[in-house]
Interface confidence: low
């Protein structure tokens, strides 16, 4: 066959879908990959051609769309499961092509088992509510296209396994669920069930999210810087190690970037011949907000290292703040017989 | 009139199994969610576990992989299945129901059914 | 997990004091809370729901308040049957939560 414009395997789009539900599968090649829709395609006379290969298969073999009651079919750029089974795991590939023209593009799909409670190898989304926000609603996602607009499908939600009902801040509203107040015990898997008839059978979608209730705006501050402070010298003679550290906080920001770092004489320590080596730590707290330390670490220092200007600087989306370190070298304690001498000197 | 009667309770050796039943009579357990909160001699209650009442259940951290809750609707009666029993397990286990389908607060409570679990 | 602390563990009063028992939750828990009445022998009986609301059947010298972490049962004129031990529990349905549902409790005695 003639050359073939081959994306390969697009791990980056790796599809689960639940057994036994249905599932719409749009061809990657019009989302990511070429610059014209499947309308344009099929206007210009190219054919989106479907196959698969089994799970530990390396055969290549055309998908059957004579299946009872359609249950594998194509409608346009979308190749639909009504529903999925365990065994249709596997890489499936669509190819665009006519006479002068070939392009595409394989990915894999996994069809994955749920418990009872939904609990699956399912990677799930991650929703972030803002703790004590006022209402906030999370939607039950990735539904569209699988009913048309007039039929109203049932939609249940649950927290865990448990089904949503008279709970005390979280009311399900359709599609959406709102949280009047959000707290920390709402922290959790959220999953909303959709029921739907279809040509006479009931399909049911299942969707879980992940709830994370996070630092509110309302709250945030610019970074606060722990340490270096005004209440701590760090005092050494030369030869010994010497050992800051940055500790700031930072108040949880959504998709803000929280940097750390050292001048050491108004320059970055890579920018300066000083052997000193900085580690950082990370933690976070129940609502995210972060704490970073650097450690600036001397092994040996030395008096023109102890006569430096040592500043911590911080930034995040709400602003940046910086701290100078106390060092300074330390006087040695002068020996008695020497002091009392002077001392007699003196009188 | 409502009632809740919990059986099956006994003394049984470490390491061994027990099922706990709890009859519900006036209530339809279609409607209502169910749970076993337990309380050793002298000490407070202690949550195990809620089921539902469309049937999905949580139990509490430490019993999970032990002891499991279950329901037959058609029977009107709830379960406790516990597995690999510890002395620590030795407890009145009550069964309770929920006000509602999930409203977390316990209405309506058995008497109890003592299990002792002793070498 | 969750953590419910009750104060006092105990208390002596007389018929026709007010008596005031409280909850405080490890973490903001909302109006998630219950309180229920426990005589020796006897199940645990329902008393207050949604932190304030005053269960079917339960006198109206029981009330409850608070929201978040700290919450108060106030009993406003002790009666002879009210000398039992109390206890609160949160009624939030999250899996981390129910081993951790139930606070200590508080005998109330006779003085």
């Known amino acids: 066959s003639e050359r073939c414009d081959d994306w390969g395997l697009d791990t980056m789009r790796q599809i689960q879908v639940f057994e036994d539900e249905p599932a719409r599968i749009k061809c990657p090649l019009f989302e990511h990959f070429l610059k014209f829709n499947y309308s344009t395609a099929h206007s210009a006379g190219l054919t989106l051609i479907w196959y698969w290969t089994r799970q530990d298969r390396d055969l290549e073999e055309p998908i059957n769309f004579r299946l009872p009651e359609n249950r594998i079919s194509k409608e346009k750029d979308v190749l639909w499961f009504r529903p999925t089974l365990l065994n249709d795991t596997g890489n499936y590939t669509c190819m665009l092509r006519n006479t002068t023209y070939c392009s595409k593009v394989a990915f894999p799909l996994e069809v994955v088992q749920k418990d009872s409670c939904f609990n699956s190898p399912m990677k799930l989304p991650v929703h972030k509510l803002y703790i004590e926000y006022g209402i906030q609603r999370i939607t039950c996602p990735n539904v569209d296209g699988y009913f048309p607009s007039s039929v109203k499908p049932t939609i249940t939600w649950y927290m865990g396994c448990y089904k949503i009902q008279n709970f005390n801040n979280v009311i399900p509203e359709g599609m959406n669920l709102s949280f009047l107040i959000a707290l920390i015990s709402n922290n959790g898997n959220y999953t909303c069930v959709v029921t739907y008839p279809e040509n006479g059978r009931t399909f049911h979608l299942t969707r879980t999210l992940t709830v994370k209730v996070v630092g509110s705006p309302k709250n945030a501050v610019p970074p606060v810087i722990h340490s270096p402070n005004d209440h701590v010298v760090y005092e050494k003679e030369p030869g010994e190690e010497l050992l800051i550290p940055c500790t700031v906080y930072f108040s949880f920001l959504m998709d803000s970037r929280n940097e750390v770092w050292w001048t050491i004489d108004g320059k970055k320590p890579d920018d300066i011949t000083i052997d000193v080596t900085i580690n950082e730590s990370i933690s976070h707290s129940r609502t995210e907000d972060e704490t970073r330390t650097q450690i600036l670490s001397i092994k040996k220092v030395t008096s023109e290292d102890l006569k430096r200007s040592y500043v911590c600087h911080a930034r995040s989306a709400k602003g940046e703040v910086a701290k100078a370190a106390k060092v300074k070298q330390k006087v040695p304690a002068p020996r008695y017989t020497v002091e009392l001498a002077c001392g007699f000197g003196a009188t | 009139e409502v009632q809740l009667e919990e059986s099956g309770g006994r003394v049984v050796q470490p390491g061994t199994s027990l099922r706990l039943s709890c009859a519900v009579s006036?209530?339809?357990?279609?409607?209502?969610?169910m749970g076993w909160v337990r309380q050793a001699p002298g000490k407070g209650l202690e949550y195990v576990a809620v089921i539902s009442s469309d049937g999905f259940f949580y139990d509490a951290s430490w019993a999970k992989g032990r002891f499991t809750i279950s329901k037959a609707n058609s029977k009107n009666t709830l379960y406790l299945q516990m597995n690999s029993l510890r002395a620590e397990d030795t407890a009145v286990y009550f069964c309770a129901r929920d006000r509602g389908t999930s409203t977390g607060s316990l209405d309506l409570w058995g008497q109890g059914t003592l299990v002792t679990v002793s070498s | 997990e969750l953590v419910m602390t009750q104060s006092p563990s105990s208390l002596s009063a007389s018929v026709g004091d007010r008596v005031t028992i409280t909850c405080q939750a490890s973490e903001n828990i909302g109006n998630g809370l219950a309180w229920y009445q426990q005589k020796p022998g006897q199940a645990p009986k329902l008393l207050i729901y949604g932190a304030s609301t005053l269960a079917s059947g339960v006198p109206s010298r029981f009330s409850g308040s608070g929201s978040g972490t700290d919450f108060t049962l106030t009993i406003s004129s002790l009666q002879p049957e009210d000398f039992a031990t109390y206890y609160c529990q949160c009624t939030y349905w999250n899996p981390d939560y129910i081993g951790g549902a139930f606070g200590g409790g508080t005998k109330v005695v006779i003085k």
């Open positions: 006036g209530i339809d357990l279609d409607n209502y969610a």
